[in-house]
């Protein structure tokens, strides 16, 4: 038998979290950021 489909509007939608560090020069230190879904938020 085929199964009846059960789903809901309450599924968890996962996004990729990407931490990155970028060297911006010898006297300026580094920028550390958190990218969520393509947008830098920190």
């Amino acid at each position: 038998d085929a199964e009846f489909r059960h789903d809901s509007g309450y599924e968890v939608h996962h996004q990729k979290l990407v931490f990155f560090a970028e060297d911006v020069g010898s006297n300026k230190g580094a920028i550390i950021g958190l990218m969520v879904g393509g947008v830098v938020i920190a």
Epitope: A2, E3, F4, R5, H6, D7, S8, Y10, E11
Partner: antibody, heavy 123, light 112 residues
């Protein structure tokens, strides 16, 4: 509040094709997790599930009736339509449309039923 | 198709007494997602069925706590701890795991 109301031709002749309409309010069939089924009940007898349509237009049918049934939805009109071909007197029954809604993940139930519409197939 | 067999067919009960209805599935109705979609409905004369219990043992909103559901796999039970006059009608079990979805034949609860 959620309401569903069925309408149909009432009396049809054998071999004809008919459409039953479920008009609903209080929810949207474009909302993830929503669905509507048609269920019928011959007078004084048991219940038989016919077909179900989901919010994303996926459909499931009772295999024994699939060749004669088509379920469709018009989200803008808040309606679900069941079309039955080649009707026979054994199709005489009260037809209910029923909402199936999700309250949480994989936690869905047929929570609201219409009042039903009586279909009589007779020559 | 999954055959749902309800017993008894008729259940005469006195007010205030307990009542129990059995529902047996011809095969397991555990869904591949791990849930068991067994529901109980009450249909009063001249009305549409109303949901009492979903997923075996969960009372639907507004359903009195005298109603309880239990079971697993293929064997399920609806119990009413103390029958009231408003409980009269036909009770149906319903499996929503396998297509086609199928109902039990119904149990008519009546007052002695």
């Amino acid at each position: 509040q959620v309401t569903l109301k069925e309408s149909g031709p009432g009396l049809v002749k054998p071999t004809q094709t008919l459409s039953l309409t479920c008009s609903f309010s209080g929810f949207s069939l474009s909302t993830s997790g929503m669905g509507v089924s048609w269920i019928r009940q011959p007078s004084g007898k048991g219940l038989e599930w016919l077909a179900h349509i989901y919010w994303d237009d996926d459909k499931q049918y009772n295999p024994s009736l699939k060749s004669r049934l088509t379920i469709s939805k018009d989200t803008s009109k808040n309606q679900v339509v069941l079309t039955i071909t080649s009707v026979d007197p054994v199709d005489t029954a009260t037809y209910y449309c029923v909402r199936r809604a999700s309250s949480s993940r994989y936690d869905d139930q047929f929570d609201y039923w219409g009042q039903g519409t009586l279909l009589t197939v007779s020559s | 198709d999954v055959v749902m067999t309800q017993t008894p067919l008729s259940l005469p009960v006195s007010l205030g007494d307990p009542a129990s209805i059995s529902c047996r599935a011809s095969q397991s109705i555990v869904h591949s997602n791990g849930n068991t979609y067994l529901e109980w409905y009450l249909q009063k004369p001249g009305q549409s069925p109303k949901l009492l219990i979903y997923r075996v043992s969960n009372r639907f909103s507004g359903v009195p706590d005298r109603f309880s559901g239990s079971g697993s796999g293929t064997d399920f039970t609806l119990k009413i701890s103390r029958v009231e006059a408003e409980d009269v009608g036909v009770y149906f079990c319903f499996q929503v795991t396998h297509v086609p979805l199928t109902f039990g034949g119904g149990t008519k609860l009546e007052l002695k």
